[in-house]
Interface confidence: medium
């Protein structure tokens, strides 16, 4: 039969605009070994890790996505447009394919929020 395995993720994470965030999926299995990990933003490829060939980051993200830590990704210089679903796909042998989902919410930076509040309240003072 198929070898059982599980993927654990933080289902919802948040980060500030301009900041960075770590996207991480944790795969656990007694016997199955990871052969490849794919990371996608919706259906857009972010990066691939292959046990044999190492990391490759897609061209469109190559200036903002750094492999690691472990089999995760560090996503830098975040914009509001980066808000959305991210998927990790673990290809394992002999266990098959396992998928995890993370929802990333990119928020206005605290500096921007504070600045906006001060601007709005200043005329009332």
């Amino acid at each position: 039969g198929a070898t059982a395995g599980t993927i654990d993720t933080k289902r919802n994470i948040s980060a500030e605009e301009g900041g960075s965030v770590i996207l991480q999926c944790h795969f656990s299995s007694d016997t199955a070994e990871v052969t490849q990990v794919d990371w996608k933003q919706q259906d857009q490829l972010l990066a691939i890790y292959s046990v044999d060939l190492g990391w490759h980051v897609a061209s469109v993200f190559s200036d903002r996505v750094v492999p690691g830590p472990s089999l995760g990704l560090t996503f830098q210089s975040l914009t509001m447009n980066d808000t959305g679903e991210y998927f990790c796909t673990y290809h394992t042998y002999p266990g098959g394919i396992y998928k995890g989902r993370i929802f990333l919410k990119v928020q206005e930076s605290s500096d921007d929020r504070n600045g906006l509040a001060q601007f709005q309240t200043a005329p009332l003072g």
Partner: antibody, heavy 116, light 106 residues
Amino acid sequence: QVQLMESGPGLVQPSQTLSLTCTVSGFPLTSYTVHWVRQPPGKGLEWIGAIWSSGSTDYNSALKSRLNINRDSSKSQVFLKMNSLQTEDTAIYFCTKSGWAFFDYWGQGVMVTVSS
Amino acid sequence: DIQMTQSPSLLSASVGDRVTLNCIASQNIYKSLAWYQLKLGEAPKLLIYNANSLQAGIPSRFSGSGSGTDFALTISGLQPEDVATYFCQQYSGGYTFGAGTKLELK
């Protein structure tokens, strides 16, 4: 065996759109990535863009605004469209396959000249 | 973008020579490097991937070495059919090529 063949017009007018077709055999487009790479006369190679096995695309950021890559998997064809061509787009255009991020099989290329 | 610098741009050698072509990356690309052979009017050929893995069907006189930022392609015993232009390519982040080394016979 794996084969790729590029086809399209040899001459394109400035400001017009280039349309190229890559016809592949020996592998399914739903399992492998196909890229476009070009070589201007006397210069090096430049990666243009790719369509992944999933159908998602990845473009050279410097060319992205002028590019569209799509495919017809049932016909084993990948299409490149590049608009607003200028003389500096004159090059040999190659399509190439990757199972990973290096290019293991290439077509012979098609020479495209941008001139009025 | 990761920049790739190849040297020399032109190399003249004799049949039987051991020749070395160099490629330097602008940042650490680990072993994510490939070498290609280009001849006019022919399909380019993958020689080496993952810095030192020989592609199937490529003669064993071709070998690759290096990791991080410094890489080399060595041809041990140059043959007339090796006259071509050679390009390195990184695939760590996106895809970029070196400017090429043209190899000719003395």
